[in-house]
Interface confidence: low
């Protein structure tokens, strides 16, 4: 059909730069078949489309080798800008991170985003959390109502770049002490002091309350 005409007229268009590397070419549509090892690429300019034979495919396309003809096929990987093969992305769209040939809006667990290259690189690997430690305060496990307990985890693998931060390796939480009073009945002087202060504060508060009640009833009677 149409190709027969193109083949017979091929010689006329050999000088046309669009026909470089072509086996079959027309003035209007450019290449329709390429020499071996070259990739057929359909270029679009406005309403016009024409075929080209390229050594490598442009961005957003990959070289699909086939027995009949090698073609530039569009990257069909989600959020991919350019790819190396049908299922391996080499550059993601803006806002997406490249990880093992795919594009992610955030890096998978164990990987950290490298903003300069928009890639997911091996992050800081940490071990499992230890059990929560003993509830203590001021290095004491008694004598207070509340204390803090801590747990830790180890850095198993340091990140590939210093700019990548490791997740927290120690955390603490408030806890209720099992023994509010220390054995032997002795209270710490500080605790005694605090208790006296608390008593004093309560007395003052009560006095103030009574004073405000007196003022209120006095105003009401006027």
């Amino acid at each position: 059909q149409g190709n027969r005409w193109r083949r017979s007229k091929r010689a006329s268009y050999v000088s046309n730069p669009i026909c470089k590397g072509c086996l079959s070419c027309s003035k209007d549509n450019g290449c329709s078949r390429c020499q071996q090892k070259l990739f057929f690429f359909l270029r679009r300019e406005g309403m016009r489309q024409y075929g080209e034979c390229l050594h490598s495919c442009p961005s957003g396309y990959y070289g699909h080798r086939a027995p009949d003809m090698n073609r530039c096929a569009r990257c069909r990987i989600e959020n991919c800008d350019s790819c190396f093969s049908k299922d391996f992305c080499t550059k993601c769209k803006v806002g997406f991170y490249l990880h093992r040939g795919r594009c992610f809006d955030e890096c998978p667990d164990g990987f950290a985003p490298l903003e300069e290259t928009m890639e997911c690189v091996e992050g800081c690997e940490v071990g499992h959390w230890s059990e929560w430690g003993t509830c203590s305060r001021n290095n004491r496990t008694c004598g207070f109502k509340w204390g803090l307990e801590t747990r830790t985890r180890q850095i198993v693998k340091k990140p590939v770049k210093d700019t990548i931060l490791c997740p927290t390796i120690a955390e603490s939480r408030r806890c209720k002490m099992t023994m509010r009073h220390c054995p032997g009945g002795k209270r710490t002087p500080k605790a005694k002091e605090k208790r006296n202060k608390k008593k004093k504060r309560k007395l003052i508060e009560r006095a103030q309350e009574q004073h405000s009640v007196f003022l209120a009833t006095d105003r009401a009677n006027q």
Partner: antibody, heavy 119, light 109 residues
């Protein structure tokens, strides 16, 4: 000569999954791209998704969360799986060979299989 | 959403020439290839035209494809109408997501 044949259940209950098989003869499924297309009772055609020669898939965004296309290269078959079907999925389902990108056309079609979704 | 609109029905007499349009709702018709399919009495669709104007072997030269940039449409022309041309005709285009036209029923008068 390339031939495609769809097979699977003709009747599926709502909320169940639909699974269809396309058996290909005369062409290795690892050397071409393959699509599933359906035709609704009102004759409207809808492209559902495709699997390329390497096993990569691409789906119609309107079906993306319900569809998956898989294959068995040893049997030269590819499959359509559609989850949570409703009566709206009642259609004739075709498998077809898709010609390489960017040409976007289907040159060989199966006979089609009528699937009714009803309780 | 990309839509390709076709006339619901066209009719013609034996030996006559008819055209079916496939109008793209947004973007240029030339941005992606258009292919055409014929479906007779609920049989499977058959490829008639691909890459705008190419005919697969076995398809008579009475069928031809073209584009009309002024109406942003792909056009299927059938010349010298035959009784066996009766049926439904669909266009297909798109890039990542393929979209079929709404379909046209061809009736011979």
């Amino acid at each position: 000569q390339i031939q495609l044949q769809e097979s699977g259940p003709g009747l599926v209950k709502p909320s169940q999954s639909l699974s269809l098989t396309c058996s290909v003869t005369g062409n290795s499924i690892t050397s071409s791209d393959w699509s599933w297309i359906r035709q609704f009772p009102g004759k409207k055609l809808e492209w559902m998704g495709y699997m390329n020669y390497g096993g990569g898939t691409y789906y119609n965004p309107s079906l993306e969360n319900r569809i998956s296309i898989t294959r068995d290269t040893s049997k030269n078959q590819f499959f359509l799986h559609l989850k949570s079907v409703t009566t709206e999925d009642t259609a004739t389902y075709y498998c077809a060979r898709e010609r390489p990108h960017p040409y976007a056309y289907f040159d060989v079609w199966g006979q089609g299989i009528q699937v009714t979704v009803s309780s | 959403e990309l839509v390709f609109t076709q006339p619901q029905s066209v009719s013609g007499s034996l030996g006559q020439e008819i055209s079916i349009s496939c109008t793209r709702s947004s973007g240029n018709i030339g941005s992606n290839y258009v292919s055409w399919y014929q479906q007779q009495s609920s049989n499977k669709p058959r490829l008639l035209i691909y890459k705008f104007d190419q005919r697969p072997s076995g398809v008579p030269d009475r069928f031809s494809g073209s584009t009309d940039s002024s109406s942003n449409s792909g056009i299927l022309t059938i010349s010298r109408l035959q009784p066996e041309d009766e049926g439904d005709y669909y266009c297909l285009s798109g890039y990542d997501k393929y979209v079929f036209g709404s379909g046209t029923q061809l009736t011979l008068l």
